[in-house]
Interface confidence: low
């Protein structure tokens, strides 16, 4: 007769490992007992269990509660055992030694491989700002056994770099995604994809990109200079900008306080019926955490009865 087993048994951490050992003998042959031991190189054999045809299963104290026979029905020639709740430390070489009658003893070895699926983590890089050079957008780390694969899935143009750290029973892989920040990347997903034989499907962690920027500010409302005359109703200045984080707007008048009756509503400055007191240099100050921008306009309210030119000065600054 001969022993049937597997060269390698692979199990995911926490699952039960079936260690197969089946004696395929001639008719009339019997199995008296099956002894299981762990036999890692350089270390003495450590007994797991003894499976006796008459007295049943005896488990060594070190494996008490962790070694069982497979559920019935059982074949008397089957010396397989179940190792419950496999841990990384269980990984190694195992030997089954089968005592048969009348053929004598047989032995076979197998290797137990315990897969440790990774628990990936994604860490965003420093705050992204338009105008930076190549910048770390995010790093993704996954540790497992064997080493996991870490890749990126995104529409964003960038570069990746990976490094691996080997530990005694596992390996940690870190992949970094670098990019040159631009405002068009705002809201774009950057997904870390981790593959591993211990995972039923790839694990994905998505990070939404936020790029700080502040567009130049400009003021609309002075396109038709002739409308800025005494008595005009509904005159307004609107400050235009965009940014991430969304900017806040502040209106001031450079050459004095805002005249009474002028309404500030966020990005808009609304005027009551115009008088000459509304003349002056108005400043829209746009700011977010990234930067600040100014746009200035000079308003000169004229008497429509007079045929004089009007100076309008537009200045944007950053």
């Amino acid at each position: 007769g001969e022993l049937e087993t597997s060269d390698v048994v692979t199990v995911v951490l926490g699952q039960d490992a079936k260690l197969p050992c089946f004696y395929r003998g001639d008719s009339g042959e019997q199995v008296g007992q099956v002894a299981w031991a762990r036999v890692d190189a350089g270390e003495g054999a450590q007994e797991l269990a003894l499976l006796h045809s008459k007295y049943g299963l005896h488990v060594s104290p070190a494996y008490e509660g962790r070694v069982e026979q497979p559920p019935p029905p059982r074949n008397p020639l089957d010396g397989s055992v179940l190792l419950r709740n496999a841990v990384q430390a269980d990984e190694g070489e195992y030997e089954c030694r089968v005592s048969t009658f009348p053929a004598g003893s047989f032995q076979a070895r197998l290797r137990l491989r315990v897969l440790v699926p990774p628990l990936p983590s994604l860490n965003p890089g420093p705050a992204l700002e338009e105008g930076q050079g190549l910048t770390l957008a995010a790093s993704c780390t996954a540790e497992g056994s064997p080493a996991p694969s870490v890749t990126w899935d995104t529409e964003v143009k960038g570069t990746t770099s990976s490094r691996s750290f080997k530990h005694s029973r596992s390996a940690a892989v870190t992949s970094e995604f670098h990019l040159v920040p631009s405002r068009s990347m705002n809201g774009q997903p950057l997904t870390c994809v981790v593959s591993h034989p211990g995972l039923l499907q790839d694990q994905r962690i998505t990070h939404i990109l936020h790029v700080s920027f502040l567009a130049e500010a400009s003021v609309r409302g002075l396109e038709d200079q002739n409308l800025w005359h005494i008595g005009r109703e509904g005159a307004m200045l609107k400050c235009l900008s965009e940014g991430q984080p969304p900017p806040s707007y502040n209106w001031t008048r450079l050459d004095g306080p805002l005249p009474s009756g002028v309404r500030v509503d966020g990005d808009t400055l609304g005027f009551p019926p115009l008088t000459t007191e509304h003349s002056g240099i108005y400043v829209c100050h746009v700011s977010n955490e990234f930067s600040s921008r100014d746009s200035q306009v000079t308003v000169d309210v004229l008497d429509p009865q007079e045929d004089s030119g009007k100076q309008v000065d537009l200045v944007s600054a950053s």
């Epitope: 700002e129 806040s248 700011s287 955490e289 990234f290 930067s291 600040s292 200035q296 600054a317």
Partner: antibody, heavy 116, light 107 residues
Framework: EVQLVESGGGLVQPGRSLKVSCAAS????????MAWVRQAPTKGLEWVAS????????YYRDSVKGRFTVSRDNEKSTLYLQMDSLRSEDTATYYC?????????WGQGVMVTVSS | NIVLTQSPATLSVTPGESVSLSCRAS??????IHWYQQKSNESPRLLIK???QSISGIPSRFSGSGSGTDFTLSINRVESEDFSIYYC?????????FGAGTKLELK
């Protein structure tokens, strides 16, 4: 009324460190970029460092990069300049200034003397 | 880095004269130049921003002009309190530079 008041100057030996502060009042500090400008005795103005409103971005002149660190505490409306590995050529009056992108308000300045 | 060159280094005038101080940038900076006055033992004071924009509280005799690379600070009828050092300044790529200054002194 906008006020910028520097403090923390003094005499320090070469290679040592010093931290100067600038307490701001009279405006919403967190809306403004801030800067440090220095002036060596009998010399002109020299920009040293600046920081954006949220404190995310900092910028330095080449000669102080790696030695000076500008920071801010928006809750305390205070600007800081940590100066390490000081050299004799860092001797100057250090001004705190509000910028956007000109320096519209300046503090009275604080004297830093680096000498053995 | 953009270099600002101020001329002349020293300007000697008598009160009542009108003067022009020059600031030249090594490359075009649109209207991104700002002017400061620094009196002896005082902090600098902003006079003009964005080449020509006046600042509240600054006497009207101070005016600025220019764009691109050539800028001028004009003082109409210099008064005794105007004898100071005048600096131009610009910002480029988040870095700031000053000119070396023009000293306005009593002739």
């Amino acid at each position: 009324e906008v006020q910028l008041v520097e403090s923390g100057g003094g005499l320090v030996q070469p290679g040592r460190s010093l931290k100067v502060s600038c307490a701001a009042s009279g405006f919403t500090f967190s809306n403004y970029d801030m800067a440090w400008v220095r002036q060596a005795p009998t010399k002109g103005l020299e920009w040293v460092a600046s920081i954006n409103p949220g404190g995310i971005s900092t910028y330095y002149r080449d000669s102080v990069k790696g030695r000076f660190t500008v920071s801010r505490d928006n809750e305390k409306s205070t600007l800081y300049l940590q100066m390490d590995s000081l050299r004799s050529e860092d001797t100057a009056t250090y001004y705190c200034a509000r910028r956007q992108p000109y320096f519209d308000y300046w503090g009275q300045g604080v004297m830093v003397t680096v000498s053995s | 880095n953009i270099v600002l060159t101020q001329s002349p280094a020293t300007l000697s005038v008598t009160p009542g004269e009108s003067v022009s101080l020059s600031c030249r940038a090594s490359q075009s900076i649109s209207t991104g130049i700002h002017w400061y006055q620094q009196k002896s033992n005082e902090s600098p004071r902003l006079l003009i921003k964005f080449a020509s924009q006046s600042i509240s509280g600054i006497p009207s005799r101070f005016s600025g002009s220019g764009s691109g690379t050539d800028f001028t600070l004009s003082i109409n009828r210099v008064e005794s309190e105007d004898f100071s050092i005048y600096y131009c300044q610009q910002r480029d790529s988040s870095l700031f530079t000053f000119g070396a200054g023009t000293k306005l002194e009593l002739k």
